[in-house]
Every structure is written in structure tokens, then in C-alpha cells.
């Protein structure tokens, strides 16, 4: 029969290095009789036999950690006791070795130029990983603005446009290397106007192009404001190249205005805005159409359809890039202005405007427009539209613009040919001939120096004294 023997640990525990998720085993070989009870502790806390993370075999002599976690790090001890003599103990350390792991990777960042950007990169690993950064395809060099912090994060002071790009952090130790996903650093730049629109002084009915160039990141949008409201007409062409937007507003000028270019871009929930303004003022509308070249053709437009003589040829002024279009838009704009005038004035003014903008034309080697006869112009001015005309002259002389008849392309009556001198040299307004049959009384107009008779106008008076000397802009 065997003699009782106190436990002796024949293979003391050693330090074990283990990788996360791998198996780690401690061996505690004991010689004794009778067979001892062996218990295991980790950091002096008993490991329970039924803990499924461990396997205890060979009568307790073999402790296996089935899948090592970084929290398993610590001092493991085995204690053997069989009641003979004292209990014996042996201890060894578990060092959990860990390939680098990025626990807080960097994320995409949008940052306004001049501010500070921090790209996080928190890592785990044993040995402790070193952290470096790559921008694009190259290792990022630290400098006075750019530093890798103790935590691994990348800090950039006073962010510049050239800092924009793709970044990734690299965590490295003796066991391996970990790379973060590529993240984008976007540097946002407040909208700024590089080229402001220029002011213009042009004739009525001219085309003007206002140009505004802006830069920013993201590329700004450009909007145009006319006298405080969104631009209602005109065409806008935009071109974007290298963060620069070039906007061109083409206008058909029928009234003066203040045009503002507004460049806007968005930074998160906030907007940045830059503004620049230009004025468009109107010079004298145009010289006599006899001085301008043109051609005779049928009127195909809509506005003056009911006013002009059917099938007649009208004069198109080739000082416009597209005469037919330009004159039609001009008359359309003019008619909109006439919405504000009296019912007596409006049809007469429409007849005057249509026959002035689309003058009857004699084709030939040199197509010649036929201006309106002075007497008909004066009839509109001093009979049908006397009140409106006086108001207009007062406003235009002060350089003001109001709705009604201001800045309309109306002729200067005193400069028109008289039908008394040459009835074939000027155009009659059929509307006024028709109205004389229906109108029996006209507003009484007195003139200090009666000078011109308006033939057959009106039916109730044999002659009507008017002054041809009114100036008209």
C-alpha cells in the first residue's frame, strides 16, 4: 500500500503569450498521494469549474482558455491540496498579444478653410501599435500645422484647400498592420466673388450681358436679383470649372435697373453669401431709323397683329442681332407697360407704338421705313393720351422710372414728317381715322402758339390746334 504524499508541483506555471481568439494553456503537473484537488484562480479570483470559457482537464492539471480575449490578461495560479501537508501553489502570467485593431476609425470630415480638423484613429494592440497616416498614396509628413497625437488622431491646424483629399490611418506592431478605410477631408471655402458685373449705360432695346464669376467650395450657385426681386426675364448661362462658376445674364433692356449677383454655398446647415451689384441705365433710345440699316418683310408676330395693316411689309432694323425677335419682345414689353394707362389712351398708344416699332416699309435697293405722320403722333400725344404724356414727360425729365408710358419706344412727334408736306412720306394710323367717326368730344387742349392742323380729326372740329414743339423721350 502507497504511503501518503504531500502535493508537489513538478512543472511550475510559466508566462504564456497568446493571441486574441487563440487557445492558451497553463500546465500544473502535481505529484501526490492521494490525488489532490486542484483549483485555479485568475488575479486571485476563483475560476469556476462550470465556466464555459475554460476547459479544466487531467484532474485539474490542465487549464485551457478556449478563446482568449484581451480581458483575459492577468496572473493565473493553480493550488493543489490533498490533506497531507500544506497546499502548494504555482503562478504564471497570461500576456494577451494583439494584432493592431482600429477601434475608432477616422470618418469623412467637411471643414471650413482656416479652422482646425481632427481625424480620429484610436487603436488597440499588444505591443501598443504605432500610428501613422497616409494621404492619397504617400505617407503624411508632420509639420507645424499637421501632427499625429498620442491617441493616434490626426490634427490639422488652420486647414488649407490643399489639405483636402483622402486619408487613412495605419496601426502597426510586431504582430501585424491594420489600415483604416479611406476617408475624405473636404475643405469648404466661403463663396467669394472674383469678378463683379459691370455697370452699363445703353439704349432702350439693347442687349446687355452681365457677367459674374465666383469661387468657393462647394462650388457656389449664382442667382441674379433685379431691383430687389428675382430676375423675371433674360437668359442665364453658367459654366463651372475648377471650383469657379461663371454666370452670364443676358438682358433685353427696356427699363433701368440695379442687378445684383449673389453667390451662395452651403456649409452644413449654414450658408455663405457674397454679393456684387451693377446698374443698367438707359441712354437716349435710338437715332432715326432712317440711319439704321434693315430689311422689309411681312410681320409674323402676335402683339401688333390686330393693329398693323394686313399683308403690309414692315421694316426690321438690323442693328439688332435678331431684328424680328428683338422688335417683338420690345413691343411685348411696351404693351405690358400700357396696362396702366386709361382705356381712351391705350388703343391709340398701341397703334402708335406698333406703327413706330414696325414702320411700313418700301422695299427697294435701300429698304426705307415710313415713319408715322406727325399729325397722328400729336393726336395720340395731345388728345388720347394727354394726361399720360404730361406725366411721362415730368417723370422722364427727372430721370425716374414708373409704370405707364415711361421709357416706351415712342417717337418724338416734332421730328416726324408732316402729311401736309408729303402725304406719301409717312404712315397714317387707321385706328385714329376710325375713332374720329365715333368720338365727338376731345379733351380741350389750348396751345400758346397754334401751328398744326390734324386733318379730319375729330369730326366735330374742322381744325384742332396743337403744338408740335413738345419734346419726347
Amino acid at each position: 500500500e502507497k504511503l501518503p504524499k504531500a502535493p508537489v508541483i513538478t512543472t511550475p506555471l510559466e508566462t504564456v503569450d497568446a493571441l486574441v481568439e487563440e487557445v492558451a494553456t497553463f500546465m500544473c503537473a502535481v505529484e501526490s498521494y492521494p490525488q489532490p484537488e486542484i483549483s485555479w484562480t485568475r488575479n486571485k479570483i476563483l475560476i469556476k469549474l462550470f465556466d464555459t470559457r475554460y476547459s479544466i482537464r487531467e484532474n485539474g492539471q490542465l487549464l485551457t482558455i478556449l478563446s482568449v480575449e484581451d480581458s483575459d490578461d492577468g496572473i493565473y495560479c493553480c493550488t493543489a491540496n490533498n490533506g497531507v501537508g500544506g497546499a502548494v501553489e504555482s503562478c504564471g502570467a497570461l500576456q494577451v498579444k494583439m494584432k493592431p485593431k482600429i477601434t475608432r476609425p477616422p470618418i469623412n470630415v467637411k471643414i471650413i478653410e482656416g479652422l482646425k480638423a481632427v481625424l480620429p484613429c484610436t487603436t488597440m494592440g499588444n505591443p501598443k501599435p504605432s500610428v501613422s497616416w497616409i494621404k492619397g498614396d504617400s505617407a503624411l509628413r508632420e509639420n507645424s500645422r499637421i501632427a499625429v497625437l498620442e491617441s493616434g488622431s490626426l490634427r490639422i491646424h488652420n486647414v488649407q484647400k490643399e489639405d483636402a483629399g483622402q486619408y487613412r490611418c495605419v496601426a502597426k506592431n510586431s504582430l501585424g498592420t491594420a489600415y483604416s478605410k479611406l476617408v475624405k477631408l473636404e475643405v469648404e471655402v466661403f463663396a467669394r466673388i472674383l469678378r463683379a458685373p459691370e455697370s452699363h449705360n445703353v439704349t432702350f432695346g439693347s442687349f446687355v450681358t452681365l457677367r459674374c464669376t465666383a469661387i468657393g467650395m462647394p462650388v457656389p450657385t449664382i442667382s441674379w436679383i433685379e431691383n430687389g426681386n428675382a430676375v423675371s426675364s433674360g437668359s442665364i448661362q453658367e459654366n463651372v470649372k475648377d471650383r469657379v462658376i461663371d454666370s452670364r445674364l443676358q438682358l433685353f433692356i427696356t427699363k433701368p435697373g440695379l442687378y445684383t449677383c449673389i453667390a451662395t454655398n452651403k456649409h452644413g446647415e449654414k450658408f455663405s453669401t457674397a454679393k456684387a451689384a451693377a446698374t443698367v441705365s438707359i441712354a437716349e433710345w435710338s437715332k432715326s431709323q432712317k440711319e439704321s440699316k434693315g430689311y422689309c418683310a411681312q410681320y409674323r408676330g402676335e402683339v401688333c397683329d390686330a393693329v398693323l395693316v394686313k399683308d403690309s411689309l414692315v421694316f426690321f432694323n438690323t442693328s439688332y442681332p435678331d431684328p424680328e425677335e428683338a422688335q417683338e419682345l420690345l413691343i411685348h414689353t411696351a404693351w405690358n407697360e400700357l396696362k396702366a394707362v386709361s382705356p381712351l389712351c391705350r388703343p391709340a398708344a398701341e397703334a402708335l407704338l406698333c406703327n413706330h416699332l414696325f414702320q411700313e416699309c418700301s422695299p427697294g435697293v435701300l429698304p426705307t421705313p415710313m415713319p408715322i405722320c406727325r399729325e397722328y403722333c400729336l393726336a395720340v400725344k395731345e388728345l388720347f393720351c394727354a394726361k399720360e404724356w404730361l406725366a411721362m414727360e415730368g417723370k422722364t425729365h427727372r430721370g425716374l422710372y414708373r409704370s405707364g408710358m415711361h421709357f416706351l419706344p415712342v417717337p418724338e412727334c416734332s421730328k416726324l414728317p408732316s402729311m401736309h408736306q408729303d402725304p406719301t412720306a409717312c404712315t397714317r394710323l387707321p385706328y385714329l381715322d376710325y375713332k374720329k367717326e365715333n368720338i365727338t368730344t376731345f379733351p380741350s387742349i389750348t396751345s400758346s402758339k397754334p401751328s398744326v392742323d390734324i386733318p379730319n380729326l375729330p369730326a366735330s372740329t374742322s381744325s384742332f390746334a396743337v403744338s408740335p414743339a413738345y419734346s419726347m423721350t
Epitope: S235, Y295, R300, G301, E302, D311, E325, E328, L329, H332
Partner: antibody
């Protein structure tokens, strides 16, 4: 790039109705006159109707007056042709066409691919 | 009723010059009819060549030119090429009681 896309064609019985639409893109629709032009199978082009930029006037070929209505919705960049009391002779490919300027009778400078209208019992 | 007349067919040799005309059954074609010319190949939508007598549409080669010859509108193709083989239509603005736009019957051009 100017694009005109017609839709709404199909087979309809004599006396029936159809509404053609033309969706416009690539230009400022409200600045241009528009037209409908048709082409019967194996035949030549035939102007049907025109409308200026503002939509304030409308013009029609004599044989469709009173039966067809052209209209436009500048806010939707869309041209329409409402065709009522259709006849066998209205069978054709209907083209939507853009005018070169604001007026209804400028040159036709851009065309859609057309939509076929068949009037048959 | 305005009737616009065109030659039904025409042929030209490659490299040759051809002039297609467009007339009115009653009266002369003038610049006031704003003659336009269109080209159409089978199965395709028409394409604008010339507008308002002699203005070339953008992208149209300068081999194509428009004019008024006598009492007709004319489309001249110089240095004809195989892919010029198409139907050619003229369109005229006309005012006879009401505004109208009238196409000719078209000319089938063959490049031999």
C-alpha cells in the same frame, strides 16, 4: 441639348379624341414659339398648329380648326395638342417642333421623334 | 389655299451641285415668306438646314445654301455627298386671310 419628347399617340376610332403632350428640356421653354407638324404614312410634312412663347395666340391649319386645340404650360415645359372629332385623314406621325424664337412662325429649329396617331375603326 | 410646289425628285452625282426650288402656285416667293429648308431621312425626324431664306442652322455644313432665285426659293447643295440622299422640304410663311405655315410636297434627292 434641346430635347422634345412626344407622348399620347395611339389607336383611336373616328370621332374619338386624343391629347398629345410634348415635354421640352435643354432650353428655356417659355422663350420660344412651338408647333405641331404631322406626316401621314409615306407622305410629306404638314403643318398643323402653332403657338407663340406667351401662349397668347394660337394658329391652325384650316382642316383642323375647331377640332384641334394647341396649348402650353410654361411652368411644366410642356406643349399640348388636344385632338377631337378625329378623322381617318388625321392618321400620321405627329412631331412637336420648337421655333427659332418667340413668335409662332419662326423657323422650326428642333424636332421631337414623333408619336403615331392612328384613326381607324 | 396656298400650295407650295417642289420638284418631286432630283438626282446628282457625288461631288456635283444641285439646286432644289420651292414655288407658290399663285405668285412669287419673296423673303416675306421666310423660306425654310428641312432635310429628312427615312424613319427619322426632320432636321433644319436653312431658315429665313439664307440663314444656315447651326451645325449645317456650308455646302448647303439658301437664296431666292427669280420667283422661287432655292436650296443649293454644292459638292454633294452620299449621305445627302434624303427628302428635302421647304416651308413658307403665308398670310392669306390668316397666318399659315405651309410645307412643299418634298423633293427626293438621289446621289448617284
Amino acid at each position: 441639348e434641346v430635347q422634345l419628347l412626344e407622348s399620347g399617340g395611339g389607336l383611336v376610332q373616328p370621332g374619338g379624341s386624343l391629347r398629345l403632350s410634348c415635354a421640352a428640356s435643354g432650353f428655356t421653354f417659355s422663350d420660344y414659339g412651338m408647333s405641331w407638324v404631322r406626316q401621314a404614312p409615306g407622305k410629306g410634312l404638314e403643318w398643323v398648329s402653332a403657338i407663340p412663347w406667351s401662349g397668347g395666340s394660337t394658329y391652325y391649319k384650316e382642316s383642323v380648326k375647331g377640332r384641334f386645340t394647341i396649348s402650353r404650360d410654361n411652368s411644366k415645359n410642356t406643349l399640348y395638342l388636344q385632338m377631337n372629332s378625329l378623322r381617318a385623314e388625321d392618321t400620321a406621325v405627329y412631331y412637336c417642333a420648337k421655333r427659332s424664337g418667340r413668335i409662332a412662325f419662326g423657323a422650326l429649329d428642333a424636332w421631337g421623334q414623333g408619336t403615331l396617331v392612328t384613326v381607324s375603326s | 389655299q396656298t400650295v407650295v410646289t417642289q420638284e418631286p425628285s432630283f438626282s446628282v452625282s457625288p461631288g456635283g451641285t444641285v439646286t432644289l426650288t420651292c414655288g407658290l402656285s399663285s405668285g412669287s416667293v419673296t423673303s416675306s415668306n421666310y423660306p425654310d429648308w428641312y432635310q429628312q431621312t427615312p424613319g427619322q425626324a426632320p432636321r433644319t438646314l436653312i431658315y429665313s431664306t439664307d440663314s444656315r442652322h447651326s451645325g449645317v455644313p456650308d455646302r448647303f445654301s439658301g437664296s431666292i432665285l427669280g420667283n422661287k426659293a432655292a436650296l443649293t447643295i454644292t459638292g454633294a455627298q452620299a449621305d445627302d440622299e434624303s427628302d428635302y422640304y421647304c416651308g413658307l410663311y403665308s398670310y392669306s386671310g390668316s397666318k399659315n405655315y405651309v410645307f412643299g410636297g418634298g423633293t427626293k434627292l438621289t446621289v448617284l
